[in-house]
Each structure stands twice: as structure tokens, then as C-alpha cells.
């Protein structure tokens, strides 16, 4: 009633470990860590035989194969590097996600190397079986812009990926009789997100209630240069549009807002985010110089406000840009309480352009962003949106333009994002 | 094309209460609010209040905050407003509009008499 | 609260004649930033609903006939029909959008 000698499978080992087995005997195959029992092209920890009346073992030795992870998950704006030869994904192979960069980074910095673990699951030291995450890159240009030191008066071209944060926003609103049609700008911030001025995004009505434009009357288009060429752009329409929930139509006050993206669109050099800047009530700093890019900055002679109630027919064909520097906060509010009307400057606006006056001073699209570059993260980050300007003609002398300072609204911009700022911390100014 | 079609006339009594309808067709309910307005027998126009049926937002003339009640049944395409401790100054023709007053609704008459 | 005031209370005019209606605003009803005034005029006939003739003081609704015209800014505005028709008899209102809404007491227009 003795049984045959058994061998253990490579990679395994049999228990209990005897010289003889007789009827009744029971061992248990296992394998070394990294390796599984397979039996029948069936995978198991462990199996047991038994030694059988008749001196013959109730099944044959299964062997032990190599534990495999199977091809990685597939990481969204992501890639993977096999560090091991041939692409093997068995046990103890390592892999590395990376970011396509230079468009996303890789959150919290993490390493993006995984291993193939005994349980057969791609393991990070950090973040476990969970996949990292790639947040979109804000605030650098494919191209560098122009240093800030000369001057420029009145608008400039800009190249094609010089502003690839801006938006185009074209809205159609047909719930209005007559139909009505208007643009303005906007600046991406991630790849679902734009932020816009909400009298943009305001249905223009015979009285002064805040009520947005219907999200179907809403295309946005990005990675655009020349209207006259829309084929090279992104054209998105709208989830979602939401108003600042105190924006105030009399003096603009929290004139800001967001359009949802309905999908995604993807980043490359001539769509990419702009930086949120720190959520500080200060603002930007008087005399700093700063960029906006528009396309209806052309016209001299015509207000922010004319421009955005005239339709398209105004529009700059090729997407210009001005340098302007921040104006004190004292010396705006005075030139504005000196004229006739109700012009009040208040703590949720800035005032940036030349006292003399000059094209600059007249920033075409409402809702652009008036960005600043900062020295400590070397990126551009969105201090300001085109918001509103004096009665007088563009450009004209001490006529500033207004600006809402967007670090007042950071944490409201996250929220309704719908992110904690920790979790998108790149994408903050540090 | 663009309808308001409102209920019809009401006879109340006194301190009691009345649900005048108005039923939108024609355009996206939602996208626009809908406006009320009041008229006494051979008096002016007073405006009573809106509300913007994509959030339920509401604003009241200060003298019929305590009067009216104005609600929205989206899936219906319907507005309602409620008065409530009627009284015999409460006679007037209601009126709703919308689309910023392009489109109006034909007038309910509430008479409160004993 | 902003107070609307007519003038005059009724008005007759000569078929074929200018009428002329003034409305003041307790308070100026021009928004400095969309540089519009929010006033507008409506007519009102016997057992109809008003109808809007005029927004932002001067803009003309669709459909309606160009002897209306609207003019002013701030407090002070005026609604002119150039040469009156008989369909024209009714009774017209401005009203505020400004801050709420708030119609003007109305003024009646009769062919003389």
C-alpha cells in the first residue's frame, strides 16, 4: 500500500516532507512566492493528493508557473516603458508610467514604476494597485513669449501656440428676438474647464437679472489663430455654464464664470491650461506687466462693450496681444470716481494700461486672460479677465482698463471644477 | 409658435386661497423666467414677481411677498402662483409673461367678494 | 424702490398727429458697463394682455410699426408715435427693469 516516491514541481514543495507515503497519506503542493499551482490549465495556491488504497497517488504533481500581471492598464495622457526585456509582465517585472509630457505631469511627482507582485497585480510603493494620475501641465507655452521689458503699443500677431490657453467663445442666442450673436475670450484651465468674465456668458436681456445663456447656445473653440481658418481649432460645445452666483450686471462686480467642456479635449502645443494663481486678496502687483491676448482688439475706436455686442463682425482675424502693466489700486478707483456715472472700482477688480492711453489700454474680448509670469514657478498664471472699461473711446488718456482679479476666486473656481486644490496642486501657482 | 395659456376665472371668498396656472409651449421652458403682473378693474399695471424655472430662483415686489407664491412644475411646462388671505382688493386680472415679455398669457380674473 | 411717473395722464391727438408721452425715473435707470438704459414701453388695449413696444429705452420690439420710436437716457425718456392711427387708441405704460420692475401709472391715448 506504499505509494511512489513524489517529486516537487520546480518552484514548489511538498508537504509534509516524507521518505515513504502510505494508503491514506495526504500531501500539499504549493509554489515558491511569485508562482502559482497550475492543474487542468487551472490556477490555485495549493493542491492536496492523497495516497490511495492501491498504492497509486489520486493525481499527478500540477506544476508551478510564474505569476504574470498581464498587460498594465492603459494610463489616459499617459505611457508605459517595460524595464525588463522582451516586455515580460511575470512576477517581479517592473514597468514605468510616464506623462506625455511636456502637455501633463505626473501627480505628487510619483516615480511611475510599478511591479508585477506575487498576486499578480502591478504594484506601486505609493500608490498600491491604484493608477497615478496625469494632470495637465498649465502655464508654458510651446513657444516662449516675448520678454516683458519693451513696450509694446497697441496689439501685436500673435504666433500660433504663443496664448494656448486661449478660448474663443462664440454664443448664439437664439431664445433672444431677434436672434442674438456676440463673442468673447476665455483661458483654458484643464482639459475640461474654461474660464471666462460672466457678462460673456450672460443671456443679454432687456433688464439687468443675471440669467446664463443656454449651454446649447455655447461653442468654444480652441487652438485657434485666425478666425478666417477655424479647421486647425478645437470647436467644443458646452455641459455646463456656470455664473459667479453674485455676479452684479450694474457694476460687474465678481464678473466671472466657467464653461464645462462636453468633453475633453486633448492637450498639444496649441491647446494647453493657463495656472490658477494663489488665493491671495491682493492681487497682482502695481507696475507689473502683464500679457492679453484677443481677437478684437483691432479697432481702437470701439469700447470692450461694443465689441462684445457686435458680433464676430469686429473680430481681429489673427489672435493679437498687448503688454500692459498694473495700475495702483488708488489711482484707478480715483480716475474712475472723476467721471460722470456710477464707475466703481471694487476689491474683486484690478486696473491695468498707460495713463497717457494708447490702443493698449483697450483690450479687445471680454473674458481673456491678463496673465503674469512668475518667476518662482516659471509659469503664466491667470491673474486677471478682460472685464469692463470707461465710457470714453479705447485708448483714450487715464482710461484704465478693468480687469476681475481672479485670486479673489480661486477656491470658488475649484469648487465648482468640482477638485480639491490638493489633488491639482501643479496646476496651482507655487 | 410661442403659447402662455392661463387657467381660468376664479369667484373666492375672503381669507381664502387661489392657484392661478399658467402653461408654456413653443420655446424651452427652462431658458427663460416667467414673469407676473397684476391689474385692479380699471387701474394700472403692477408687477408681482418671477421666477426662473431652470433653479426656482424667485424675486418678489416687497408688496406681494407676503400675497404670492410662485412655483414651477418643469415636466408640466407649468407656472403657478398662489394668493393667499385673499380679499376683496385682491380683485384684479392676473397675467403671466415670458420670454421678457414678448409672449403673455390671456388674464385669469380673480374676484373676491363675500 | 424706484417710482415711475407719466405725463400726461391722457392724451388726445389728431389722427395723422405727433403724441408724445414722458416718463421720469425717480432714480437714473442707465447701467454704466452695458451702457444701456432699462426702460421700455408697452400699449395696452381694452381686455388685452400689453404688448411691448419698446426695450432699453430705444430699441423697437420685432413686428412693431416704425412710427413708434423711444428716446432718453438716465431719468427722463419719452415715447413718440409720429403720426397717430386709429389702432393706436389704448393705454401705455413704461416700466423699469433696472432694479425689479415698476410700471408708470399709464397714459391714456384717445383720437381727439
Known amino acids: 500500500n506504499e505509494c511512489p516516491e513524489l517529486q516537487p514541481p520546480v518552484h514548489g514543495k511538498i508537504e509534509p516532507s516524507q521518505a515513504k507515503y502510505f494508503f491514506k497519506d495526504q500531501v500539499l503542493v504549493s509554489c515558491d512566492t511569485g508562482y502559482k499551482v497550475l492543474k487542468d490549465n487551472v490556477e490555485m495556491d495549493t493542491f492536496q493528493i492523497e495516497c490511495l488504497k492501491d498504492g497509486t497517488w489520486s493525481n499527478k504533481i500540477p506544476t508551478c508557473k510564474i505569476v504574470d500581471c498581464r498587460a498594465p492598464g492603459e494610463l489616459e495622457h499617459g505611457l508605459i516603458t517595460f524595464s525588463t526585456r522582451n516586455n515580460l509582465t511575470t512576477y517581479k517585472s517592473e514597468i514605468k508610467y510616464s506623462c506625455q509630457e511636456p502637455y501633463y505631469k505626473m501627480l505628487n511627482n510619483n516615480t511611475g514604476i510599478y511591479t508585477c507582485s506575487a498576486q499578480g497585480v502591478w504594484m506601486n510603493k505609493v500608490l498600491g494597485r491604484s493608477l497615478p494620475t496625469c494632470l495637465p501641465e498649465c502655464g508654458q507655452p510651446s513657444r516662449s513669449l516675448p520678454s516683458l521689458v519693451k513696450r509694446i503699443i497697441g496689439g501685436r500677431n500673435a504666433e500660433p501656440g504663443l496664448f494656448p490657453w486661449q478660448a474663443l467663445i462664440v454664443v448664439e442666442d437664439t431664445s433672444r428676438v431677434p436672434n442674438d450673436k456676440w463673442f468673447g475670450s476665455g483661458a483654458l484651465l484643464s482639459a475640461s474647464w474654461i474660464l471666462t468674465a460672466a457678462h460673456v456668458l450672460r443671456s443679454q436681456r432687456r433688464d439687468t437679472t443675471v440669467i446664463p445663456v443656454s449651454k446649447e447656445h455655447v461653442t468654444v473653440y480652441l487652438g485657434l489663430h485666425d478666425v478666417r481658418d477655424k479647421s486647425g481649432a478645437v470647436n467644443s460645445s458646452a455641459a455646463r455654464v456656470v455664473l459667479h452666483p453674485d455676479f452684479n450686471i450694474q457694476n460687474y462686480n465678481h464678473d466671472i464664470a466657467l464653461v464645462q467642456l462636453q468633453e475633453p479635449v486633448p492637450l498639444g502645443p496649441h491647446v494647453m491650461p493657463v495656472c490658477l494663481p494663489r488665493l491671495e486678496p491682493e492681487g497682482p502687483a502695481p507696475h507689473m506687466l502683464g500679457l492679453v491676448a484677443g481677437w478684437g482688439i483691432s479697432n481702437p475706436n470701439v469700447t470692450v462693450d461694443e465689441i462684445i455686442s457686435s458680433g464676430t463682425r469686429t473680430l481681429s482675424d489673427v489672435l493679437q496681444y498687448v503688454k500692459l502693466p498694473v495700475v495702483p489700486h488708488a489711482e484707478c478707483k480715483t480716475s474712475y470716481e472723476s467721471r460722470s456715472g456710477n464707475y466703481s472700482v471694487t476689491e474683486n477688480m484690478f486696473c491695468a494700461g498707460y495713463y497717457e492711453g494708447g490702443k493698449d489700454t483697450c483690450l479687445g474680448d471680454s473674458g481673456g486672460a491678463f496673465v503674469i509670469f512668475d518667476d518662482l514657478s516659471q509659469r503664466w498664471v491667470v491673474q486677471g479677465l478682460v472685464s469692463w472699461g470707461g465710457p470714453e473711446e479705447c485708448g483714450s488718456k487715464q482710461v484704465y482698463g478693468v480687469y476681475t482679479k481672479v485670486s479673489n476666486y480661486v477656491d470658488w473656481v475649484w469648487e465648482q471644477m468640482g477638485l480639491p486644490q490638493s489633488v491639482v496642486e501643479p496646476q496651482v501657482e507655487r | 409658435q410661442v403659447q402662455l395659456v392661463q387657467s381660468g376665472a376664479e369667484v373666492k371668498k375672503p381669507g381664502a386661497s387661489v392657484k392661478v396656472s399658467c402653461k408654456a409651449s413653443?420655446?424651452?421652458?427652462?431658458?427663460?423666467?416667467i414673469n407676473w403682473v397684476r391689474q385692479a378693474p380699471g387701474q394700472g399695471l403692477e408687477w408681482i414677481g418671477w421666477?426662473?424655472?431652470?433653479?426656482?430662483?424667485?424675486k418678489y415686489n416687497d408688496k406681494f411677498k407676503d400675497k404670492a407664491t410662485l412655483t414651477v412644475d418643469t415636466s408640466s411646462n407649468t407656472a403657478y402662483m398662489e394668493l393667499s388671505s385673499l380679499r376683496s382688493e385682491d380683485t384684479a386680472v392676473y397675467y403671466c409673461?415670458?420670454?421678457?415679455?414678448?409672449?403673455w398669457g390671456q388674464g385669469t380674473l380673480v374676484t373676491v367678494s363675500s | 424702490d424706484i417710482v415711475m411717473t407719466q405725463s400726461p395722464d391722457s392724451l388726445a391727438v389728431s389722427l395723422g398727429e405727433r403724441a408724445t408721452i414722458n416718463c421720469k425715473s425717480s432714480q437714473s435707470l442707465l447701467a454704466s458697463r452695458t451702457r444701456k438704459n432699462y426702460l421700455a414701453w408697452y400699449q395696452q388695449k381694452p381686455g388685452q394682455p400689453p404688448k411691448l413696444l419698446i426695450y432699453w429705452a430705444s430699441t423697437r420690439e420685432s413686428g412693431v410699426p416704425d412710427r413708434f420710436s423711444g428716446s432718453g437716457s438716465g431719468t427722463d425718456f419719452t415715447l413718440t408715435i409720429s403720426s397717430l392711427q386709429a389702432e393706436d387708441v389704448a393705454v401705455y405704460y413704461c416700466?423699469?427693469?433696472?432694479?425689479?420692475?415698476?410700471f408708470g401709472q399709464g397714459t391714456k391715448v384717445e383720437i381727439k
Open positions: 416700466k423699469q427693469s433696472y432694479n425689479l420692475y415698476t
Open positions: 413653443g420655446y424651452t421652458f427652462t431658458t427663460d423666467d
Open positions: 421666477i426662473y424655472p431652470r433653479d426656482d430662483r424667485t
Open positions: 409673461s415670458s420670454l421678457e415679455d414678448t409672449y
